[in-house]
C-alpha cells in the first residue's frame, strides 16, 4: 500500500490508523495515497512543520487521545484537501495562529476536551468553509467579538462545558446558518439581549448547566425556527410573559432543576410540536387556570418535585393529547373534582409522595383511559364509592404507605381491591393505620369485624362485593404499563452530553433512572 | 414489648459521611413507618425523614440532597446515611415510630439515641 | 416549609398554677375537609427522649393525664398545664404535619 509505517495499519481504502504509547512521533513515511489518518492514544507531545506534507489527498485527519500539547504553526501544510480535523482529547493549551492556513475544504473542526484557555478572531478567519466547531470540554473564561465572524457557514458551534462567565451579544451576530449551539455546563448568568437575534435558522440551543437567573423577554425572539431548547439546571427564577411567544417549531423545552416559583397563564406562547414539557424540580407552589392551554400536542407534563400545594380546576385545560401526568412529591392536600376533566387521552399519572387526605369521587370521571395511577405515600384514610370503577384498562394501582382507616367505610374499596388484587402489584399492599387493633394488616385481607365500626351509615356501594378467586378470568392483565417516559427524564440527543445517573426514590418519576439535563 | 435501639453514631471528620442503624423490635417494619430526629445539645428537635411500611420515603428538604433512609425488613433494621458533614451535623440522632397513636406522623416509641460529633 | 414558633422560651411556674405555653404556625393547619389541625405536642425531660403528649391540637394521647389539654386552631395554638407537677418540669414542642413535620424551637418549663 505505497509504504505501510510499522505501527500503523493500512486498508485498501486509503485509510491509515497509528495507534500505541510506543510512538512518539508521527509514523513515516505515510502512504502518498491517504485519505483518511488516524493517530489515536499515542505519547505524540508535539506536531513539528508540515509532517503531513506528501499526502496531499488526506480529506480526514484525526489526531485524538494522545498527550499532545504544542503545535507548529505549519503542520496541517499543504492540506488542502482536508474536510475533517480532530485535535479533541489532547493537552492543548494554546493554538498557534495561522495553525488553520490553508485549509480552504475544512468543513469539520474539533478542538474539543484539551485546555484551551482562549480563541482569538485569527483563529479561524480562513476558514470560511467550516460547518461545525467543537470547542466543548476547554478552559475558555470568554469569546472575543470577531472570533467567529469569518464562519458564515457554521451549521454547528459547540462551546459546552467551558468556563464562560458572560457571552458578547456580537458574538455570534454573523452565524445565519447556525443550526446548533451548546453552551451547556458553563457558568454563565446572563444572556444579553439580542444575543442569538442573528440566528435565525437555529434548531437547537443548549443553555442547561449555567448559572442563569434572568432571561431577557426577548431572548428567542428571532429564533423562530428552534426545535430544542434547553434550559434546565439553571437558577431561572421567573419567566417574562413573551419569553416563549415566537417559538412555533419548539418540540423539546427543558425547565427543570431552576427555582421557578411560579407559571402564568400562557407562558407557553403557542407551541403546536411541543411534545414534553420538563418541569420537576423548582419551585412552584401553584398552577393557575389555562396555564398550558396552548399546549395542545402536550404529551408528557413533568411537574414532580416542586411545591404545589393549589392546583386551579381549569389548569389543564387544552391538554387533550397528554399522555403522561407527573405530580409527585408535591404538597397537594386536595384536589377539585374536575381538574383532570380535559385530559381524555391521559394513561399515567403520579401523585405519589403529596399530602392528600381525600380524594373527590369524580377525579378520575372523564379520563377513562388511565392505564397506571400512583397514589402511594399519601395520607389516604379512604377513596370514594366507585372512584375507580370506570377505568377499565387500568392495570397498575399503587396505594400502600397510605393510613387507611379500616373501619366498616372501607368495606366498599376492601372489596374492590379483593377483586382487582393484581392491579396492586405484589411488592407492597396497602395496610390499615386505624384503628390501631389492627395497624399493620393488609386492607385486602383485613376482617373488618375486628375494626371499631364507623360512625356514619355507609353508602350503598357500588364497587363490585363479589370475592375475588384465583381462578377467575375477569381480572386485568397484571402486565406493568409504566412506560419508559416514566422511567427516565428527559435525553438530549446529543452524544456529547449524555450523562445517565443512579438515583434512589427520589427521581423524577420516582423509579430508577434520571438524565441530569 | 416495642423496642428501638439506635447504633452508628461516634467522631466523624467533616466532610465525611455517617451510617445509622436503628434496630427494631416487637413490631414489623413492614407494618409501620420509622423517623428520624436529630436534636443538637441544648437545641431544638430537628425532623430529619421517614421511610414507612411500603419502603416510600420522605425527607426534610433542607437536608434531602445529603440523606438517605434505607430498611431492610428481614434484619428489622432501619438506617440513615448522611453525606458531606459539617460541625452543625453534631447533635444526638432518634429513631421513633407510631406505634398507637392515630397521628400518622406522630412518634410514640422513641429510642435512647446514638451521638454523632463532627469534628477534624 | 412552615415555620412554628412558640412562646415563650422559657417559663417558670409555681406548683399547681397553671402553665400556658403558645405555639404559632407560618400557616394554617388546618385541613378544611377532614377538619383537623395537624399539629402535636411534645414533651422532653432531661437526658430523656421525647414523648408524644396530644395530637389533632387537642387529642391526648393515651396514658397521659387529663392535666394536659391542647387548644387553638388555624395558626394559633396553646398547651395548658392546669396544675403543674413536679414531673411536668421538661422541654416542649409544638410540631406541624400539615406539611412535612416541623418543630417549634420549644419551651422549657421549670418550678418557680
Known amino acids: 500500500y505505497h509504504g505501510c509505517p510499522s505501527e500503523c495499519t493500512c486498508s485498501r481504502a486509503s485509510q491509515v490508523e497509528c495507534t500505541g504509547a510506543r510512538i512518539v512521533a508521527v509514523p513515516t513515511p505515510l502512504p502518498w495515497n491517504a485519505m483518511s489518518l488516524q493517530i489515536l492514544n499515542t505519547h505524540i507531545t508535539e506536531l513539528n512543520e508540515s509532517p503531513f506534507l506528501n499526502i496531499s489527498a488526506l480529506i480526514a485527519l484525526r489526531i485524538e487521545k494522545n498527550e499532545l500539547s504544542r503545535i507548529t504553526p505549519g503542520a496541517f501544510r499543504n492540506l488542502g484537501s482536508l474536510r475533517y480535523l480532530s485535535l479533541a482529547n489532547n493537552k492543548l493549551q494554546v493554538l498557534p495562529i495561522g495553525l488553520f492556513q490553508g485549509l480552504d475544504s475544512l468543513e469539520s473542526l474539533l478542538l474539543s476536551s484539551n485546555q484551551l484557555l482562549q480563541i482569538q478572531p485569527a483563529h479561524f478567519s480562513q476558514c470560511s468553509n467550516l460547518k461545525e466547531l467543537q470547542l466543548h470540554g476547554n478552559h475558555l473564561e470568554y469569546i472575543p467579538d470577531g472570533a467567529f465572524d469569518h464562519l458564515v457557514g457554521l451549521t454547528k458551534l459547540n462551546l459546552g462545558k467551558n468556563s464562560l462567565t458572560h457571552i458578547s451579544p456580537r458574538v455570534f451576530q454573523h452565524l445565519g446558518n447556525l443550526q446548533v449551539l451548546r453552551l451547556y455546563e458553563n457558568r454563565l448568568t446572563d444572556i444579553p439581549m439580542g444575543t442569538f437575534d442573528g440566528l435565525v435558522n437555529l434548531q437547537e440551543l443548549a443553555l442547561q448547566q449555567n448559572q442563569i437567573g434572568l432571561l431577557s423577554p426577548g431572548l428567542f425572539h428571532n429564533n423562530h425556527n428552534l426545535q430544542r431548547l434547553y434550559l434546565s439546571n439553571n437558577h431561572i427564577s421567573q419567566l417574562p410573559p413573551s419569553v416563549f411567544m415566537q417559538l412555533p417549531q419548539l418540540n423539546r423545552l427543558t425547565l427543570f432543576g431552576n427555582s421557578l416559583k411560579e407559571l402564568s397563564p400562557g407562558i407557553f406562547g403557542p407551541m403546536p410540536n411541543l411534545r414534553e414539557l420538563w418541569l420537576y424540580d423548582n419551585h412552584i407552589s401553584s398552577l393557575p387556570d389555562n396555564v398550558f392551554s396552548n399546549l395542545r400536542q402536550l404529551q408528557v407534563l413533568i411537574l414532580s418535585r416542586n411545591q404545589i400545594s393549589f392546583i386551579s380546576p381549569g389548569a389543564f385545560n387544552g391538554l387533550t393529547e397528554l399522555r403522561e401526568l407527573s405530580l409527585h412529591t408535591n404538597a397537594l392536600q386536595d384536589l377539585d373534582g374536575n381538574v383532570f376533566r380535559m385530559l381524555a387521552n391521559l394513561q399515567n399519572i403520579s401523585l405519589q409522595n403529596n399530602r392528600l387526605r381525600q380524594l373527590p369521587g369524580n377525579i378520575f370521571a372523564n379520563v377513562n383511559g388511565l392505564m397506571a395511577i400512583q397514589l402511594q405515600n399519601n395520607q389516604l384514610e379512604n377513596l370514594p364509592l366507585g372512584i375507580f370503577d370506570h377505568l377499565g384498562k387500568l392495570c397498575e394501582l399503587r396505594l400502600y404507605d397510605n393510613p387507611w382507616r379500616c373501619d366498616s367505610d372501607i368495606l366498599p374499596l376492601r372489596n374492590w381491591l379483593l377483586l382487582n388484587q393484581p392491579r396492586l402489584g405484589t411488592d407492597t399492599v396497602p395496610v390499615c393505620f386505624s384503628p390501631a387493633n389492627v395497624r399493620g394488616q393488609s386492607l385486602i385481607i383485613i376482617n373488618v369485624n375486628v375494626a371499631v365500626p364507623s360512625v356514619h351509615v355507609p353508602e350503598v356501594p357500588s364497587y363490585p362485593e363479589t370475592p375475588w378467586y384465583p381462578d377467575t378470568p375477569s381480572y386485568p392483565d397484571t402486565t406493568s404499563v409504566s412506560s419508559t417516559t416514566e422511567l427516565t427524564s428527559p435525553v438530549e440527543d446529543y452524544t456529547d452530553l449524555t450523562t445517565i445517573q443512579v438515583t434512589d426514590d427520589r427521581s423524577v418519576w420516582g423509579m430508577t433512572q434520571a438524565q441530569s439535563g | 414489648e416495642v423496642q428501638l435501639v439506635e447504633s452508628g453514631g461516634g467522631l466523624v471528620q467533616p466532610g465525611g459521611s455517617l451510617r445509622l442503624s436503628c434496630a427494631v423490635s416487637g413490631f414489623s417494619l413492614t407494618s409501620y413507618g420509622v423517623h428520624w430526629v436529630r436534636q443538637a445539645t441544648g437545641k431544638g428537635l430537628e425532623w430529619l425523614g421517614v421511610i414507612w411500611a411500603g419502603g416510600s420515603t420522605n425527607y426534610n428538604s433542607a437536608l434531602m440532597s445529603r440523606l438517605t433512609i434505607s430498611k431492610e425488613n428481614a434484619k428489622s433494621s432501619v438506617y440513615l446515611q448522611m453525606n458531606s458533614l459539617r460541625a452543625g451535623d453534631t447533635a444526638m440522632y432518634y429513631c421513633a415510630t407510631h406505634m398507637h397513636t392515630e397521628d400518622y406522623y406522630g412518634m410514640d416509641y422513641w429510642g435512647q439515641g446514638t451521638t454523632v460529633t463532627v469534628s477534624s | 416549609d412552615i415555620v412554628m414558633t412558640q412562646s415563650p422560651d422559657s417559663l417558670a411556674v409555681s406548683l399547681g398554677e397553671r402553665a400556658t405555653i403558645n405555639c404559632k404556625s407560618s400557616q394554617s393547619l388546618l385541613n378544611s375537609r377532614t377538619r383537623k389541625n395537624y399539629l402535636a405536642w411534645y414533651q422532653q425531660k432531661p437526658g430523656q427522649s421525647p414523648k408524644l403528649l396530644i395530637y389533632?391540637?387537642?387529642t391526648r394521647e393515651s396514658g397521659v393525664p387529663d392535666r394536659f389539654s391542647g387548644s387553638g386552631s388555624g395558626t394559633d395554638f396553646t398547651l395548658t398545664i392546669s396544675s403543674l407537677q413536679a414531673e411536668d418540669v421538661a422541654v416542649y414542642y409544638c410540631k406541624q404535619s400539615y406539611n412535612l413535620p416541623t418543630f417549634g424551637g420549644g419551651t422549657k418549663v421549670e418550678i418557680k
Open positions: 389533632w391540637a387537642s
